[in-house]
Amino acid sequence: TLNSVLNSNAIKNLPPPLGGAAGHPGSAVSAAPGILYPGGNKYQTIDNYQPYPCAEDEECGTDEYCASPTRGGDAGVQICLACRKRRKRCMRHAMCCPGNYCKNGICVSSDQNHFRGEIEETITESFGNDHSTLDGYSRRTTLSSKMYHTKGQEGSVCLRSSDCASGLCCARHFWSKICKPVLKEGQVCTKHRRKGSHGLEIFQRCYCGEGLSCRIQKDHHQASNSSRLHTCQRH
């Protein structure tokens, strides 16, 4: 379990996981005061710093990535971990600290002059190479929506949803990410049963549109757990 993994790393007082993947209800939380956390972000507290459960890199801070805290650990038990500095081992870009990216399993400095070419090359090469995904790239570099003069249309390569035009989101398609339509009422959606499961999707769906949530289709209540169909429904 998440708690046992964290306890083994001397991290105390982890509450139940907060929030959830798209379509999941959030969890109730309460603020906890404490003393400032040195060396971290000015808002962190050291006496009750609690790791943040996550399902994907985008949910973490800019200097973090989402992974299991133990090597070879349960993929469903993931928290936000500190990014890796230059020359440290990596498996994907998001693991490397800002200003760096993952090349041949090592975090290397991003040379902004040829950086865009590197990314385009990575997108091309990454088909079939799970370690070269673009997840988390958006928060690391200058290649953000500002570099795209027009918002991406459906099918355009993207790094995050803000790169896409209104009504589209950035979702995984094979091992890169493209702009796909945000789901409308009645469309089939993906309800993730456990943390981290959408990291396994090759064809990721967008989230449900505004005012909709991903819920089990009423006439499928009797079906077995594995075959239940979820659709976007009004709140």
């Epitope: 939380v29 801070g61 200097d63 949803s161 803000s162």
Partner: nanobody, 129 residues
């Protein structure tokens, strides 16, 4: 100039519903968490609900869980809060706030008001019994 403008407040009977909107201008807010806080007369400002930059994470105070739903539309730089089954104790001024994505995140980040850089002027919600 960055501005957050709330709308949708008003008076309603207990059990009724309201939908608050918060529109941000002056910069893109897709890399910010958006949240609602509230302050009742004579009480401290308290956290109500937040939604992360990634759109996939929502957080709620115990007192509103199951009754309020927070959402956002990044393309329109707008956050929403659907409030249903309202109670007299929900009466307060509701403030929209925006917090930047931090370098390191903890479970307390979304609920701590000092993390929020931008605040709206507030919208009054009054629930009568």
């Amino acid at each position: 100039e960055v501005q957050l403008v709330e709308s949708g407040g008003g008076s309603v009977q207990a059990g009724g519903s309201l939908r608050l909107s918060c529109t941000a201008s002056g910069r893109p807010f897709d890399n910010y968490a958006m949240a609602w806080f509230r302050q009742a007369p004579g009480k401290e400002r308290e956290f109500v609900a937040a939604i992360s930059w990634s759109l996939s994470r929502t957080h709620y105070a115990d007192s509103v869980k199951g009754r309020f739903t927070i959402s956002r539309d990044n393309a329109k730089n707008t956050a929403f809060m659907q409030m249903s089954s309202l109670k007299p104790e929900d009466t307060a001024v509701y403030y929209c706030a925006a917090a930047p994505r931090p370098k390191r995140i903890s479970v307390q980040y979304f609920t701590t008001s000092s993390n929020y850089d931008y605040w709206g002027q507030g919208t009054q919600v009054t629930v009568s019994s």
